[in-house]
């Protein structure tokens, strides 16, 4: 198993608009972030 | 709509093998990380695996208890994930199924008895 | 591995009542960045999971803001302020931020 904080947190997951770096790789390859446009169902944290 | 679709479940005897498949529609896939979970008959949630999208080299991971038995894997062009599960065994007898952790599939029944 | 210890097991709630599910890490879910990566689902019966709370305490959308998450790095809470009748099923709570993922082991909501 890799190392799961190796450069990014596993568990910074999906919310558009919050990507800033590697911790953020899960939102860069959500469904949710996949979608573009539309309706996205979870709204980025305030 | 986000669609995840899983299918290939059945009843087998331990020893087997079995292969999942979850097509999906609805986004666009090649670069989406999806996962495995499985629910047990005691109603147990347990991350089997994940894989990750093309430019992350379509990496794998697992969970320690299954590895080296379960192996993930997609094909691009299907826009499908796979769950290849051998020598299964009769605790490998769950609900499985595919899930962005965001959208999740309606899930595929294993059963695993001899 | 990081364990999730929920509690309770079960819950009878009278429609109207509030309801309240803890859940305790043995980790700190804390990420770098200062994110806490704690997650409830909720399955309903003969249903799929469904997120509820993402990050400790965001509403996911199209989730009633009956419900709402806190808590801190290792202590978490679910609370259901007015419990209906769709809220019953097996509630659970989860974190992504270390391999392997993990899944408390479930809280399931009945009604009185």
């Known amino acids: 198993l890799a190392d799961p904080l190796d450069h990014r947190d596993a568990g910074d997951l999906w919310f558009p608009g919050e990507s800033e770096s590697f911790e953020d790789a899960h939102v860069e390859h959500s469904i949710s972030r996949s979608l573009l446009e539309g309706e996205i169902p979870f709204p980025p944290t305030s | 709509e986000v669609q995840l679709v899983e299918t290939g479940g059945s009843l087998v005897q331990p020893g087997r093998s079995l292969k999942l498949t979850c097509a999906t529609s609805?986004?666009?896939?090649?670069?989406?990380?999806l996962h495995w979970i499985r629910r047990s008959p005691e109603n147990q949630l347990e991350w089997v695996g994940q894989?990750?999208?093309?430019?992350?080299?379509?990496?794998?991971y697992y969970a320690e208890s299954l590895q080296g038995r379960f192996t993930i894997s997609r094909d691009d062009s299907e826009r499908s994930i796979y769950l290849q599960m051998n020598n299964l065994k009769e605790e490998d007898t769950a609900i499985y199924y595919c899930t962005g952790l965001d959208y999740w599939g309606q899930g595929v029944m294993v059963t695993v008895s001899s | 591995d990081t364990v999730l210890t929920q509690g309770p097991l079960s819950v009878s709630v009278t429609p109207g009542e509030s309801a309240s599910i803890s859940c305790r890490s043995s980790k700190s879910l804390l990420s770098s960045k200062g994110i806490t990566s704690l997650y409830w689902y909720l399955q309903k019966p003969g249903k799929s999971p469904q997120l509820l709370i993402y990050r400790m305490s965001n509403l996911a959308s199209g989730v009633p803001d009956r419900f709402s998450g806190g808590g801190s790095e290792t202590d978490f809470t679910l609370k259901i302020s007015k419990v209906e009748t769709e809220d019953v099923g097996v509630y659970y709570c989860?974190?992504?931020?270390?391999?392997?993922?993990?899944f408390g082991a479930g809280t399931k909501l009945e009604l009185k």
């Open positions: 894989i990750k999208g093309k430019s992350d080299n379509y990496a794998t």
């Open positions: 609805g986004f666009t896939f090649t670069n989406v990380w």
């Open positions: 989860a974190q992504f931020l270390q391999y392997p993922y993990t």
